[in-house]
Amino acid sequence: MAVTACQGLGFVVSLIGIAGIIAATCMDQWSTQDLYNNPVTAVFNYQGLWRSCVRESSGFTECRGYFTLLGLPAMLQAVRALMIVGIVLGAIGLLVSIFALKCIRIGSMEDSAKANMTLTSGIMFIVSGLCAIAGVSVFANMLVTNFWMSTANMYTGMGGMVQTVQTRYTFGAALFVGWVAGGLTLIGGVMMCIACRGLAPEETNYKAVSYHASGHSVAYKPGGFKASTGFGSNTKNKKIYDGGARTEDEVQSYPSKHDYV
């Protein structure tokens, strides 16, 4: 039960995290005009990964996309790449983890396959979260550097624009969304990896037990359970009876001791 809960919670946490990474990537407020210790202007500037915006006090907002690709700073391109990689990995991870969920039965999928898929999705979530955290952190570092370098007529490094008024930019809401979302995706991934350990059948040794029943002589032979050697191997436990009784491969699958921890 704990494994299912851990896996389910990991999936939900990762889902929220990836939704947050997507939201952060699309948001315009990665950097916002620093209002502290500056003249009070009737316009407010903010910038995202894809466009820069100006909101006038009148309420009118105008956004302009960065239509150039080569003219953009390498750091901005790197941040874009990290966020997109994070989203793609996260999306694939979500797809894989849906099929890996213990509560969802797909054909006669074995526990080992589900364990494999859970581990794969967990690793994907971890890498996705790290990509998002790295992307946001690189952008934040770029902002901090530009903030202290920011002087009149300085190249901002964001949109290739020349500043004639000292406009300094500080952390926008998207950075905090990105950090939190990346963290959640990372946590979700770790939870999936933990859940995977519980899903994987353990190496089990059973000693031979023999007893005499009236009328019939039945012995459970030693080595009656074929131990699993790891992911990808045959983990179906074949009970070997005298008289060649049918194996568990031929019967409907029921919860085994490996389902619950």
Partner: antibody, heavy 117, light 113 residues
């Protein structure tokens, strides 16, 4: 069509509070800001302050301690209160709508306020 | 506060001739975010409220004749009336719409020579 109309007493005694109302039509006060501007007889324009669509205000520092701009969006009215008036506050008072570029695109006809005992 | 200085104080131009009014601000009115200058021009005829002519330094308001044009960037701006008409006799004001308080220039009176 967009219209703004200032109203209020034409004569105010020194040290009293000047109260003016700007009634607007043709637009919503929740979407547009309204500025107050005054013009002493034969002189230039002086910006008093503004109330934005979101309710935030900005005032001219030279008048800030004496001025209050508020609005009642449901009545489509913006009010200006200027306390402790002197003869120097005698002017034509205008209200105007704020649009693109923070520019004042529609103005009221103005109301002359004289400060005299 | 930003000081807006207009020149000349008054200007007499013959009908059909070009009229040029200058406006200088004590600080740049160029916003780096959209590369727009937050300077506005108004026309005020005697006994009337001011009328918006140009915003963002060079964008004509709807209904404004194309003989009116604005130019300039940063701190130096110009309003040009390419061919003065009798109805253009008025006082012209520039305004800083960038940094509070939103100050006006002293005005330039345009008359017919």
């Amino acid at each position: 069509q967009v219209q703004l109309q200032e109203s209020g007493p034409g004569l105010v005694k020194p040290s009293e509070t000047l109260s003016l109302t700007c009634t607007v039509s043709g637009f919503s006060l929740t979407r547009y800001g309204v500025s107050w501007i005054r013009q002493p007889p034969g002189k230039g324009l002086e910006w008093i302050g503004v109330i934005w669509g979101d309710g935030n205000t900005n005032y001219n520092p030279s008048l800030k301690s004496r001025v209050t701009i508020s609005k009642d969006s449901s009545k489509s009215q913006v009010s200006l209160k200027l306390s402790s008036v002197t003869a120097a506050d005698t002017a034509v008072y205008y209200c105007a709508r704020v649009n693109f570029g923070n520019a004042l695109d529609y103005w009221g006809q103005g109301t002359l306020v004289t400060v005299s005992s | 506060d930003i000081v807006m200085t207009q020149s000349p104080d008054s200007l007499a131009v013959s009908l059909g001739e070009r009229a040029t009014i200058n406006c200088k601000s004590s600080q740049s009115l160029l916003n780096s975010g959209n590369q727009k200058n937050y300077l506005t021009w108004y026309q005020q005829k005697p006994g009337q409220p001011p009328k918006l002519l140009i915003y963002w330094a060079s964008t004509r308001d709807s209904g404004v004749p194309d003989r009116f044009s604005g130019s300039g960037s940063g701190t130096d701006f110009t309003l040009t009336i390419s061919s003065l008409q009798a109805e253009d006799v008025a006082v012209y004001y520039c305004q800083n719409d960038f940094i509070f308080p939103l100050t006006f220039g002293g005005g330039t009176k345009v008359e017919i020579k």
